[in-house]
Interface confidence: medium
């Protein structure tokens, strides 16, 4: 049959060539002299020429050595033909397989392997993957098939097989227990891969293997007791630094410290911090530490990394001994600040309390009392008692020193210690009213029209507190009555004046007496200017101008000028009569409003 | 101020030892590797190995059967031993500090150097 | 083992002019994992002990002056002299840290006009 199996033939073929491979025959040769020719890929197309064909006899034949990993198959067409040309057969499949010899060695994909593992890992764990190539024929023979092997480790410690490589997949293996970045960071293996699955060409590599590090190292005291010296009282002071070694990488959680107090801080007054670039413990103070109570303190301090042990490791304590130094202590004011309730206006020398100091100090230190701040002046104090006693009269009405009844004092006490300590405490007197002030109007001067006039309302105010104040009365004195009424408004804080008669354009005085809930009385001048108009009014017009029935001559005129003349000398002593009787009538009034005005100034 | 100082024979005869000392301060052995190099009078340098902190080493796999590096971490001391020297091992031989003991360091790199010591190796 | 090659093995140079050496590997220096190239630079000058100028290919070591520069990455590596000084008269090699043993380069000569 005009019919080709596959034919094989090896690699890198010695010849001699032309080699005989196979012969192609047509069974329509015996009608015909039959022509045998190939075409395709080897033959007559590129790579040309690697096979022919005997044309007359059919023999096929290989011209060159062949390379499977240049070209594993070639599949070429058989044609016969007659003498005048004419085709005898279809085209023939002709498939020529190349079988393979070792001819390649096993190729690394890199010189150098760099992989890393942590310390201490069990055997087992992986480390790393290396890949070896062959380009031999690994599916049909074992030429390619690559086998991998370690020849040798470098340290050899703690011994010679710390890994393995497994044999078909090139993965490296922990294999023994003991690694230990302390003592070896990083092992260099020589790999090997060689192929016939192992029985044939070696090449080899390097893979390096870094060790990494795990928490096997606990860090250590060094030293392991400390004895510090601290002055009591002091918060946040410094008490020890306490330092600590670890073999771990440093900076890495497996070797930054956290400290703990584990004992001897019974009353919470130390704290300890990890300092950030010393990796030292920092014990501090976090209250102030009280000689008299506690002299001594023994700590026990632990510590730990911020990575929990990867194995088990005992925790390192260090013993801290503390010394509570004696520091002479400021008296203290019990309570700090003391409440007192006092009158105002106490006589002089009446005594407002006792306030004293207690020494925090073992020794029986003397303590003397003085007042360190008294801004009006109200008080004294005796140096041996802390008896505090009214010098001055202490006013609940004086804004400028009592601030919502509360007139604060400072006081200090000494003791005699060595050097002596001053402490400091806070007397506020909390003032009881007393109706010493008398109801005010406000305002004091006013205008009013006297046609139809506006009532003018005057706000009442009182410096005291309830009950010393409104319901307010009032009452005008001084013959005041006959041209003007004062009325409170229901509500007892406001008066209401108004002008009843018929009064000339001129300045009056109004004698307004006012009275608070308590009865205490208060005369008040009311200043009243009256003018010339009607209803409401802010100022008064122009000047008032009387009539005149005369003419334009010089006569009339030198009688006016006489007239007027006449009349400002009788005003003038009209003036004078009336301002007599007025001093004589609101003196007392008077007096006491400069009382009060020279008791506002002196505040 | 780390400093490192070499202490040797100055001649050796063929086929003898070498021994080197190698003393440190400044800082402990135990914080960081000391490596060991040799420079061939006009030529270039060799690595011949490193003594890890923890005592563990590693050796130039083309001297390392003649090769020997221990240290004393009390004494602040490296100790060099080479077999078998011959005319070609004549060369100054330094001592160095590895940058530090881990890899993010760039423990390979040598910061700090000895003078170095001259072995002359001659009958 | 790993073999490094610098080039030139001597050039001259005037005082302030910028100088380039190279150093090439035999095989990549970059290690993936931390994107780190195991190179370091050394000065020797006449009669002293090698000094390290920069580690990691181009990481400069405290103390060392600005004008020089290492870079480079994988195989080809460059130490970069920006003005040169008279007393930068030295040789100056390249090591690898990559793989064991470390290796280092033959060294390039520097010499001012």
């Known amino acids: 049959d005009w019919v080709v199996a596959p034919i094989s033939v090896p690699e890198n073929g010695k010849g001699p060539f032309p080699q005989r491979l196979n012969q192609l025959k047509s069974n329509k040769d015996r009608d015909t002299k039959i022509f045998y020719s190939i075409t395709g890929p080897g033959a007559d197309s590129p790579p040309e020429g690697v096979f022919a064909v005997e044309k007359e006899t059919g023999w096929l034949l290989l011209n060159k050595p062949l390379d499977r990993e240049e070209i594993a198959k070639y599949e070429l067409f058989g044609h016969a033909v007659s003498e005048n040309g004419a085709s005898v057969e279809d085209p023939m499949n002709i498939s020529i397989i190349v079988t393979d010899q070792n001819d390649h060695k096993p190729k690394f994909t890199q010189d150098t392997f760099r992989g890393s593992v942590l310390e201490g890992v069990l055997p087992g764990t992986s480390v790393m993957q290396v890949t070896a190539t062959d380009e031999d024929d690994a599916i049909y023979t074992y030429n390619g098939v690559v086998a991998y092997s370690i020849h040798s480790q470098e340290p050899k410690d703690p011994h010679d097989l710390m890994f393995t490589i497994h044999r078909s997949t090139g993965t490296i293996s922990v294999i023994s227990s003991g690694l230990d970045r302390e003592k070896v960071p990083e092992y260099t293996l020589t790999i090997q891969a060689t192929d016939m699955d192992g029985d044939g060409s070696t090449t080899t590599a390097v893979a390096v293997v870094e060790i990494l590090d795990a928490n096997d190292n606990a860090p250590m005291f060094e030293p392991q007791k400390y004895e510090a010296w601290v002055p009591e009282n002091e918060v946040g002071h410094e008490v020890q630094r306490l330092t600590v070694t670890d073999l771990d990488v440093p900076n890495s959680p497996a070797w930054r410290a956290t400290y703990h107090i584990v004992g001897g801080d019974d009353g919470d007054h130390f704290t300890i911090t990890t300092h950030p670039e010393t990796n030292q413990g920092v014990l501090t103070t976090k209250k102030g530490l009280d000689f008299e109570a506690q002299d001594q303190h023994t700590l026990y301090v632990e510590v730990t990394n911020e990575a929990p042990f990867a194995v088990k490791l005992p925790t390192a304590t260090a013993t801290v001994v503390v010394h509570v130094k004696d520091v002479n202590e400021a008296p203290v004011f019990v309570p700090p600040s003391k409440v007192v309730e006092v009158q105002e206006g106490i006589p002089t020398g009446e005594p407002v309390c006792v306030y004293t100091a207690e020494d925090p100090d073992k020794e029986n230190q003397k303590i003397s009392y003085r007042i360190l701040r008294d801004p009006a002046g109200w008080l004294a104090m005796d140096p041996d008692s802390g008896q505090v006693t009214a010098v001055g009269t202490l006013d609940r009405e004086d804004e400028q020193f009592v601030r919502n009844n509360i007139y604060e004092v400072m006081v200090l006490a000494m003791d005699n210690g060595s050097p002596p300590t001053t402490g400091t405490g806070t007397l506020l007197l909390t003032l009881i009213d007393v109706n010493d002030h008398g109801p005010v109007p406000e305002p004091r001067q006013i205008t009013i029209c006297n046609q139809s006039p506006v009532r003018q309302v005057l706000n009442i105010t009182d410096k005291d507190l309830s009950p010393h104040t409104s319901p307010f009365q009032a009452q005008l004195t001084d013959d005041s009555d006959i041209y003007w009424t004062a009325e409170v408004n229901e509500e007892g804080d406001t008066v209401v004046l108004s002008l009843k008669k018929f009064l000339k354009q001129d300045t009056y005085d109004v004698h307004l007496s006012l009275s608070d809930h308590g009865n205490k009385e208060q005369l008040t001048v009311i200043r009243a200017t009256v003018c010339d108009c009607h209803g409401h009014v802010e100022t008064c017009p122009g000047p008032w101008k009387g009539g005149s029935g005369g003419g334009g001559s010089g006569a009339g005129v030198i009688a006016v000028i006489v007239v007027v003349v006449i009349a400002i000398v009788a005003g003038i002593v009209v003036l004078v009569i009336s301002r007599k009787k007025r001093m004589a009538k609101y003196e007392k009034a008077e007096i006491k409003e400069m009382g009060e005005m020279h008791r506002e100034l002196n505040a | 101020v780390q400093l490192l100082e070499e202490s040797g024979p100055g001649l050796v005869t063929p086929s003898q030892s070498l021994s080197i000392t190698c003393t440190v301060s400044?800082?402990?052995?135990?914080?960081?590797?000391i490596n060991w190099v040799r420079q061939p009078p006009g030529k270039g340098l060799e690595w011949l190995g490193v003594?890890?902190?923890?005592?563990?080493?590693n050796y130039n796999s083309a001297l390392k059967s003649r090769l020997s590096i221990t240290k004393d971490n009390s004494k602040s001391q490296v100790f060099l031993k080479m077999t078998s020297l011959q005319t070609d091992d004549t060369a100054r031989y330094y001592c160095?500090?590895?940058?530090?003991?881990?890899?993010?360091?760039?423990?390979?790199?040598?910061?700090?150097w000895g003078q170095g010591t001259t072995v002359t190796v001659s009958s | 083992e790993l073999v490094m090659t610098q080039s030139p093995s001597s050039l001259a140079v005037s005082v302030g002019e910028k100088v380039t050496m190279s150093c090439k590997s035999s095989?990549?220096?970059?290690?993936?994992?931390?994107?780190?190239?195991?190179l370091a630079w050394y000065q020797q000058k006449p009669g002293q002990s090698p000094k390290l100028l920069i580690y990691?290919?181009?990481t400069r070591e405290s103390g060392v002056p600005d004008r020089f520069t290492g870079s480079g990455s994988g195989t080809d590596f460059t130490l970069t002299i920006s003005s040169v000084k008279a007393e930068d008269l030295a040789v100056y090699y390249c090591?690898?840290?990559?793989?064991?043993?470390?290796?280092f380069g033959g060294g390039t000569k520097l010499e001012i006009k």
């Open positions: 160095a500090k590895s940058r530090g003991v881990y890899d993010f360091d760039g423990r390979g790199a040598m910061d700090y």
């Open positions: 400044g800082f402990s052995l135990t914080s960081y590797p």
């Open positions: 003594i890890w902190t923890g005592g563990g080493t």
């Open positions: 095989q990549s220096l970059l290690y993936s994992s931390n994107q780190k190239n195991y």
């Open positions: 990691w290919a181009s």
């Open positions: 090591q690898q840290y990559y793989s064991y043993p470390y290796t």
